[in-house]
Interface confidence: low
């Protein structure tokens, strides 16, 4: 997508002003263009930094200008670099003294892998010295002084990519400033081939265009454009779309154009010579005047454009009859488009003859990404390419370019895309009032995040049920009434804002939950849940006297806390209890009930109970004896839930007395966890046991606890917390 061009004016430096201009045509770089010395090509050239300035005549161009007094510091190799999406495109060129002892035949030479190549330098000064040839600054070849020919040549019978580089020639007594340079570019592939494996056939690039070995595209010489470089530009214009213009009195005279490899450097069409200041001879045209006109039907030959065909004829030699080719034109593309973030399908529409094909239309994002059409159609007069961006975001805002490149020429149209953030309310809607079948809502649509203006608002609502789909109503006011709701149902609410344009529906805002009022009967009163046995619980309630004549029944739902086990039981309305059976011993159950007619009633609060135990209870835990005085002591303990413990027994006796002389204290309230023993003898050791009883029997104490009362004079410590029986 980057059309980078380096203009070297003039490559042979005398005492006149000389310059390098680097132009990024039809492309807006995010990173600046740089011009620098190419030390890769020539290590030992001048080290001075370059004074790079903005070219005032062009938006995206940089320039280095050397005044005549700096002529001695100019010799060397240079580059211009542009970056797009992190990928660098570098164009190389050279400048040398016009007074050098040798001059190259051409500034650059592009050959295919395997070609038989002669790199030649013309001798312009005769000296009694050996001639030497260097490649990238390293010596490769010398010619004895008596054998230096008029044309000094380096012969490469089978050129390989590693042969590429800057070749220089001079006399041995000379230096960098008397050297002549030429750059050999060796395409990675053999003639007419491209691709990673060089197994694709190149498009026929006309008018001395060069096939790029990585993309298969033609790099067109200055003055030609289109997919095959067949289309000549208007006079004195250049660039991929012929939009750039040479401003000199004689057009592009004295401009050497350097393009990305493997093109190298050449004159613009109509000019030749190392300085591009010689016009083509009659019958020749094109870059470096290398193309010969052989126009059919006696048509005119123009040194810039080649054969000028009469209407109805076309081709390089006007050899084909047919409709005249028409450079493509991009139509119906506004300069500015506002887009909502999300999916975006931009359309590029173009005319021309032949009509552009799917492959010939592309869309370039501001970051340089090239998109190809996802869909394509055409009418008699237009081709329409539809592109798909699955998720366009605000950072994608900027200048996009629709590009069309056919055999009839190339055109690019930049347009500005402004990506908007979809609006989303910051607050959840508020519920002002509810009934059993309606709710009054304040939709709280402002403030919102994202871009306006808001075109419409939707209130979305649904029951909080795994399978219910969202329903919505369009709203214009901030206060809205939702009707036809289900009673005793929890609903979710949220607001969706819509801004203008396609895909303007924002993400729904925060969710508010509310529950509609009940119209069912109230739950049974006086509910009581008690264990009956190891496998049954008994649920009882007060008699129900409904106000209407409708048949009714009690629905009881029980579920196990420990297991995924749930059961619903229907009980006739005239009963006041139900035995829940087939339960598991020592398991906790949650039960609730409601009174149903045709409409379902309101559920009661949850009741919880354990079935009776099927094993002896475990010993009370955390047994502590504290607050000991001369005649009393406090015993505390904890018991485990779920073992149907009905009572706690404390057994104590004076140590050493017979077993049958013990005292038993039975505590029938199992929620009590503390007891004060009284009437004890001072300074006496007691043996204390504590055990729990349930429906199966008593727990087995593991060991006894010892308690020694204090002498009569000592004061007791503070009393501990907990429920206590005195």
């Amino acid at each position: 997508a980057m059309d980078l061009i380096l203009i070297n004016s003039l490559p042979l430096v005398s005492d006149a002003e000389t310059s390098l201009t680097c132009i990024a045509s039809g492309w807006r770089p995010h990173e600046p263009i740089t011009i620098g010395r190419d030390f890769e090509a020539l290590m030992n050239q001048h080290q001075d930094p370059l004074e790079v300035t903005q070219d005032v005549t062009r938006e995206w161009a940089k320039k280095v200008v050397w005044k005549r007094e700096k002529a001695s510091k100019i010799n060397g190799a240079y580059f211009c670099e542009g970056r797009v999406r992190g990928e660098a495109i570098r164009i190389r060129t050279m400048k040398m003294r016009q007074q050098a002892s040798f001059l190259p035949a051409t500034l650059t030479m592009t050959v295919d892998k395997g070609d038989n190549v002669n790199i030649s330098f013309k001798k312009v000064l005769i000296k009694e010295e050996d001639a030497v040839i260097y490649k990238n600054g390293s010596f490769i070849h010398s010619v004895p002084r008596h054998e230096v020919p008029d044309i000094l040549e380096v012969h490469l019978p089978h050129a390989q990519p590693q042969d590429a580089g800057v070749y220089s020639a001079r006399y041995i007594g000379g230096n960098l400033f008397t050297s002549a340079f030429t750059r050999l570019i060796v395409r990675r592939c053999e003639a007419q081939k491209w691709g990673p494996e060089c197994n694709h056939l190149c498009t026929a690039c006309m008018n001395n265009g060069v096939c790029h070995e990585d993309t298969g595209e033609c790099i067109c010489p200055p003055g030609f454009m289109g997919r095959t470089c067949e289309k000549a530009c208007e006079l004195h214009t250049f660039g991929r779309t012929c939009k750039e213009r040479c401003s000199g009195q004689e057009g592009c005279k004295s401009y050497v154009f350097c393009l990305p490899d493997p093109y190298g450097c050449s004159c613009a069409t109509g000019w030749k010579g190392l300085q591009c200041n010689e016009a083509c001879h009659p019958g020749f045209y094109g870059p470096d005047c290398k193309l010969r006109c052989s126009c059919n039907n006696g048509e005119m030959c123009d040194r810039f454009q080649g054969c000028l065909c009469s209407p109805g004829w076309q081709g390089l030699q006007c050899e084909r009859e047919g409709i005249q080719r028409m450079t493509p034109k991009i139509v119906d593309l506004p300069d500015h488009i506002e887009v909502n973030s999300g999916k975006f399908n931009p359309i590029c529409k173009a005319s021309g003859w032949p009509l552009p094909t799917n492959e010939e239309m592309t869309l370039v994002k501001p970051d340089g990404t090239v998109l190809h059409p996802k869909d394509f159609n055409h009418t008699d007069h237009f081709s329409v390419a539809i592109f798909t961006i699955h998720r366009i975001l605000p950072p994608d805002s900027g200048v996009w370019v629709c590009s069309v490149n056919t055999v009839a020429g190339m055109v690019e149209k930049p347009f500005n895309i402004s990506v908007k953030v979809l609006p989303k309310p910051l607050n959840a809607p508020n519920v002002i009032d509810t009934g059993h079948n309606f709710a009054v809502i304040n939709i709280s649509s402002e403030p919102y995040f994202g871009d306006g203006p808001i075109k419409s608002k939707k209130l979305l609502y649904k029951p909080v049920n795994h399978y219910e789909a969202w329903q919505h109503i369009q709203v214009t006011n901030e206060i809205v009434t939702l009707n036809y709701l289900e009673p005793r149902t929890e609903y979710e609410l949220c607001v969706q804002l819509v801004r203008r344009g396609e895909g303007g529906e924002g993400h729904p805002g925060p969710v508010r939950r509310f529950t509609t009022a009940s119209i069912g009967l109230p739950p049974p009163r006086g509910l009581n849940l008690l264990p009956k046995s190891q496998t049954t619980l008994n649920l009882t309630w007060q008699p129900i006297f409904p106000s209407s004549e409708d048949d009714f029944y009690v629905e009881v739902e029980r579920r196990s806390v420990q297991k995924s086990d749930q059961q619903n039981i229907k009980v006739p309305g005239n009963l006041t209890s139900v035995l829940l059976n087939n339960l598991h011993p020592r398991e906790q159950y949650v039960v609730r009930a409601r009174v149903n007619t045709k409409a379902q009633g309101e559920w009661s609060e949850d009741l919880t109970a354990w079935t009776l135990s099927d094993i002896l209870p475990p010993q009370p835990e955390n047994i502590k004896i504290s607050n000991i005085t001369h005649s009393s002591a406090v015993i505390s303990w904890t018991i485990l839930d779920g073992y149907s413990i009905s009572s706690i027994t404390i057994r104590y006796k004076v140590q050493g007395k017979n077993e049958d002389q013990h005292v038993d204290v039975k505590i029938k309230n199992a929620t009590i966890t503390q007891y004060q023993l009284k009437g004890l003898e001072p300074e006496t050791a007691y043996q204390v046991d504590i055990f729990a009883e349930n429906n199966i029997g008593s727990s087995n104490p593991a060991f006894s606890h010892e308690l020694v009362t204090l002498p009569e004079s000592q004061a007791p410590a503070d009393l501990g917390g907990g429920k206590m029986l005195l």
Epitope: P463, V464, N465, H466, Y467, E468, Q566
Partner: antibody, heavy 122, light 108 residues
Framework: DVQLVESGGGEVRPGEPLRLSCAAS????????MSWVRQAPGEGLEWVSV????????YHADSVKGRFTISRDNSKNTLYLQMNSLRVEDTAIYYC???????????????WGLGTLVTVSS | EIVLTQSPGTLSVSPGEKATLNCRAS??????LAWYQQKPGQAPRLLIY???NRAAGIPDRFSGSGSGTEFTLTISSLQSEDFAVYYC??????????FGGGTKVEIK
Amino acid sequence: DVQLVESGGGEVRPGEPLRLSCAASGFTFNTYGMSWVRQAPGEGLEWVSVISGSGGSTYHADSVKGRFTISRDNSKNTLYLQMNSLRVEDTAIYYCAKDSGSWTSSGFFDYWGLGTLVTVSS
Amino acid sequence: EIVLTQSPGTLSVSPGEKATLNCRASQNINSKLAWYQQKPGQAPRLLIYDAGNRAAGIPDRFSGSGSGTEFTLTISSLQSEDFAVYYCQQYYDWRPLTFGGGTKVEIK
């Protein structure tokens, strides 16, 4: 004890309709979501349709959308699947399955019927 | 649509040995995963829900683990009645509910 019994399967030609039924017992039918799940011969399980306890909300897999309709009659404790425009690829055993959650549908199935075979062939 | 991928397709195990079945989700499903057992000619039977909870009446040799995208069903010591096809099912996204392709556990 929860029981689900499917009926209505059989052999039909492509394009013809068929209606499956599932009789439910042993639980409060109108509080549970119900689904149809099918299994082509020798293949895995594919969820087809779901209906909420009240019958107010339904959802279908894309493969049957517009052709199949799920419904229920809570007074008869019966679930239905109306299948129109049947295709050869609809050949399968159709199971009716009870959602495990009562108060809110959970999306997995604690009880399944034994299934009814639907064969679509020309 | 959330895609569930079960591996291996077939698992050959000797009675008494441990079996480990895997289920991978194409996106995060938290713990919303169930496992079912299906024997030839029978309907599927719920074994595990919420990735690690055993359904009522399921022996404790069956256990489930995992969350997010990687889940495992482990049968600690295979009994003869455990040889069957096992399916995982996600219910994080019910549009649609989806099942894995199944793992067949066969006698080695």
